[in-house]
């Protein structure tokens, strides 16, 4: 049979066909039925729901739908022993206390199994001692403190605000400065839209809305007691002192009617400049310690908080493909959520729901894809991406073999503006082409496509006419997939205007007040942006499964590289005397650019002229397709970061939520200035870019003709 | 309708003691601080205690420090204060009332909500 | 926590305008922004008609207002109308976390 004739693809089943069958109004009544509880990670609520999901998928029509568990790191609080901080007085009163829990949202006041705000993996401890504010606790904000302002938080109990970057790099770098404790708190200048009330009137958060979070620093390891190997029966688990990530100093946080109690009393040095200021009616002082009257006064901080291994399920579901069941597809999202999961990630896991149900009704129409479609609902991805890691781990070599692609569906929604989408440069033409071919939800747009919509309002910085497609960081279950396996991944959600909200994510982000409400009546009624994201994922997981040639464009790649190594070099050339002084050149790199850009040229034109009808050549560049990103993989990993694999892109390691550019070089750069041994310091910077070079000529190879 | 209403005054004996309830509804009061405040017979008002929604916090007037406790059951969405060691001078018509603000930590940005008071004799 | 210190009375004619005083110390009115008043009819419980010094609760009439200056705040109504008559009280946070009254004004409208 012909590769159309074996996947059944007449005009009934085609894209339109499985585009046409998702409704809002199904995703709508998924969302209600997936936030009524909680579904924290480890618990049985959890379990039950991974249970109904696989019930439910397995009537939906996949072939299989199975759950794997592992028995993993979590972290929860102590239920008779709760955390908080005080201030005590000179004789050890405490005379304020921080909340033990937030004021629960109209109609969820009998809730049970409300987990109270926490830091996920802190360690237990009582420090007290001095405050100082450290803003948002960046690399540069330390850098501010302890370089020009000549502050010292070594023994200090630091209080940072949330947002610019990953909790779990605030911590670190907290942890670097000889902080004692940290206290994390959302300051409305980053929570709090001007104009829009807080919840339950509005999507803003009320001054007792707490976001919750991990704090570890895995770098990609998984479950932190079997860092590169599953957490299954028969797992050699590290003892606690040699786990991966996990921080030394207690950690808890707060919201800003606490915060305010807190900073209010805060005296020593003024805020360095008005960037350091949020919107309290506190004067942000840096401190170290409180003012005047109440400089006899201190911070203690309760942390109690225990780290138990506990057994955790994915939903892995499989809808084979009919002509090349050994090539994966994978459309995954988590299912844990830290309360209510509102947004995070139940619009995900609703729209995730409704593809797969779509998809099931095309195939009991007697339609497969070419390719296999996994579906994963993944477990404990708020405690590290512990679910999908460790499936991940305990598949690699499948993974590595048979891995086409990597969709990611978390949260649906963080706005309801536009489009945001962030995936490898292989996927731009495949984004670009199926919202061309979407129709936009957007007010304003009516009968005009999503890309129209999408490039008006996010319009690429470097190319016009076309929208702005992020680079891949982290945070998020695609991590293993795109960073550790190198296997193409994406993902596409809608978002907020970020020209004009300057907060941090959206503003309940893991608090309780993630609810269904909350989705329903403030930031998609209709579900109409639901539905976009549904058709943007499930139309890339159905091109991506069922094109005869793979939608991945190398091109692409190599203008990206070109602009990447513009940029590091220009970084670079911030030292021309140190560049000079130890031999640093880049024409490596360029060169290898060069060679990239020119092979990829010649691999798209055989790909117009290949004859497709011959399944070992169409078989073979689809090959050459699917393993160009497993091609920019180091089996070494970056420099402390084995994990993190990809040469051209890893997690920031001042942020793991954003992406960084040939990292190793990166990294090897950033504040060379301040190295002690600079001879060394510009020698790695060579070995990085040999590496890159290497790297980057290594991929452009596996696109010449074979033979 | 929003409603605080006060239940168990009484008169009663010095030194002995007596338990205040005050059953809220018509609003979420598992996220509202509350208070009690007092006033004696033809004088004026004296504030007495409050209770932090989730009862991390307590403040009492120094007048009935060690002697009175306040507490709170959000699942029966009730207030209570427990009187101790009661004088003749914590004769008073108790009121209970809401803080203005939902979830919040510093209870004095007013008190919207009163109830209509139970009254407290304590005589020999 | 002493009482703050109020004026025991205070009188005006319909239409007229009347101030009532509010004094403590810094360490309550003059060192936090929460000072609050109430209205109390003989034998109803206090209603709140201004809270953090200046603001109005839905509900209350413009014609009250509120201001602070240095450790005394002050509660003006303006147009006073026979309904007015009644008992005001302010109270204040203090340093200690607790909250004081003042001793009441009674305002009569001749």
């Known amino acids: 049979k012909s590769s159309n004739e074996a996947t059944n693809i007449t005009p009934k089943h085609n894209m339109k066909a499985f585009l046409d069958e998702l409704k809002a109004e199904n995703i709508k009544k998924f969302l209600y039925n997936f936030t009524q509880i909680p579904h924290l990670a480890g618990t049985e609520q959890n379990f039950q729901l991974a249970k109904q999901i696989q019930s439910q998928w397995k009537e939906f029509g996949l072939d299989s739908v199975e759950l794997a568990h592992y028995d993993v790191l979590l972290s929860y609080p102590n239920k008779t022993h709760p955390n908080y901080i005080s201030i005590i007085n000179e004789d050890g009163n405490e005379i304020f206390n921080t909340s033990l829990f937030e004021p629960p949202p109209p109609g969820y006041e009998n809730v049970s199994d409300i987990v109270p705000p926490f830091s996920a993996f802190s360690p237990q401890g009582m420090p007290e001692g001095d405050l100082v504010y450290v803003n948002y606790a960046r690399t540069e904000d330390f850098f501010k403190l302890e370089r020009d302002m000549k502050i010292n938080c070594s023994g200090k109990i630091v209080i940072a605000r949330y947002g610019k970057v990953f909790r779990g790099n605030k911590v670190k770098n907290a942890q670097l400065a000889g902080a004692k404790g940290v206290i994390l708190y959302s300051d409305p200048a980053d929570y709090f839209a001007p104009g829009v009330k807080s919840y339950p009137d509005g999507w803003n958060l009320p001054g007792g809305g707490v976001q919750r979070g991990n704090i570890l620093n895995l770098n990609g390891a998984g479950d932190p007691l079997t860092p590169g190997y599953p957490a299954n029966e028969y797992a050699y688990r590290r003892g606690i002192a040699e786990a991966v990530g996990l921080p030394s100093i207690p950690v808890h946080p707060i919201g800003y009617y606490d915060a305010q109690k807190l900073l209010e009393k805060m005296g020593g040095s003024a805020p360095p400049d008005s960037s350091w200021r949020g919107s309290l009616k506190v004067p942000y002082n840096v401190g170290p310690g409180f003012t005047g009257n109440f400089s006899t006064q201190k911070v203690k901080m309760h942390i109690h908080s225990t780290n138990e291994v506990t057994r955790i399920y994915n939903v892995i579901g499989t809808l084979r493909g009919a002509v090349e069941p050994d090539r994966y597809v994978i459309l995954g999202g988590h299912r844990d959520s830290w309360v209510f999961g509102g947004i995070d990630p139940q619009s995900g896991a609703a729209v995730v729901h409704e593809i797969v149900r779509s998809f099931g009704t095309l195939k009991k129409e007697g339609w497969r894809p070419r390719r296999t479609i996994l579906f994963a609902s993944w477990d404990a991805e708020e405690f590290g991406l512990l679910g999908s890691t460790e499936w991940a781990e305990e598949n690699s070599r499948l993974l590595q073999e048979r891995g086409v692609a990597y969709i990611n569906a978390d949260s649906s929604i963080e706005g309801n503006y536009t489009l945001r989408v962030d995936c490898t440069p292989l996927m731009y033409s495949l984004v670009h082409n199926l919202t061309k071919e979407l129709k936009s939800p957007d007010e304003g747009f009516e009968g005009k496509s999503l890309y129209e919509s999408w490039t008006k309002k996010s319009p690429s910085p470097e190319f016009s006419g076309m929208p702005r497609i992020s680079k891949l960081g982290s945070g998020n279950d695609f991590e293993v997939f795109f960073q550790r396996l190198g296997i193409a991944s994406g993902r596409a959600r809608y978002t907020k205007n970020w020209e004009t909200n300057k907060f941090s994510g959206y503003p309940l982000y893991h608090s309780v007040y993630e609810t269904y409400e909350l989705v329903e009546k403030f930031y998609d009624p209709m579900f109409k942006y639901h539905l976009t994201v549904a058709q943007v994922r499930g139309g890339m997981v159905f091109e991506l499964a069922n094109s005869i040639v793979l939608p991945f464009d190398c091109r692409d790649y190599a203008v990206v590289l070109r602009k990447y190594a513009d940029k590091i070099y220009s970084i670079s050339m911030k030292h021309p005397q140190e560049m000079k002084t130890y031999s640093v050149s880049f024409d490596s790199l360029f060169s290898a650019v060069k060679n990239f850009t020119e092979i990829a040229s010649k691999f798209s034109e055989r790909l117009q002229d290949f004859d497709k009808s011959n399944p070992i050549v169409l078989r073979m560049m689809n090959d050459q397709l699917m393993f160009l990103e497993r091609a920019f993989i180091d089996p070494l990993g970056l420099p402390d970061r084995p994990f993190y694999r990809h040469v051209i892109y890893a997690p920031s390691s001042h942020n793991k939520y954003a992406g960084e550019s040939f990292p190793g070089i990166y990294d090897a750069l950033f504040d060379i200035e301040s190295k002690v041994d600079p001879s060394k310091a510009w020698g790695e910077v060579k070995r990085q870019i040999y590496v890159a070079a290497f790297t980057v000529q290594a991929a452009a190879e596996t696109l010449s003709e074979v033979a | 309708e929003v409603q605080l209403v006060e239940s168990g005054g009484g008169v009663v004996q010095p030194g002995r003691s007596l338990r205040l309830s005050c059953a809220a509804s018509g609003f979420s009061f598992s996220g509202y601080g509350m208070h009690w405040v007092r006033q004696a017979p033809g004088k004026g008002l004296e504030w007495v205690a409050v209770i932090s929604y989730d009862e991390s916090n307590k403040y009492y007037a120094d007048s009935v420090k060690g002697r009175f406790t306040i507490s709170r059951d959000n699942s029966k969405n009730t207030l209570y204060l427990q009187m101790n060691s009661l004088r003749v001078e914590d004769t008073a018509v108790y009121y209970c009332a809401r803080d203005r603000i939902w979830g919040s930590r510093g209870y004095y940005y007013g008190m919207d909500v009163w109830g209509q008071g139970t009254t407290v004799t304590v005589s020999s | 926590q002493s009482a703050l210190t109020q004026p025991a009375s205070v009188s005006g004619s319909p239409g007229q305008s009347i101030t009532i005083s509010c004094t403590g110390a810094?360490?309550?009115?003059?060192?936090?922004?929460?000072v609050s008043w109430y209205q109390q009819h003989p034998g109803k419980a206090p209603k709140l008609m201004i809270y953090e010094v200046s603001n109005r609760p839905s509900g209350v009439s413009n014609r009250f207002s509120g201001s602070k200056s240095g450790n005394t705040a002050s509660l003006t109504i303006s147009g006073l109308q026979a309904e007015d008559e009644a008992d005001y009280y302010c109270s204040s946070y203090t340093i200690t976390s607790t909250l004081v009254f003042g001793g009441g004004t009674k305002l009569t409208v001749l």
């Open positions: 810094s360490s309550d009115v003059g060192g936090y922004n929460y």
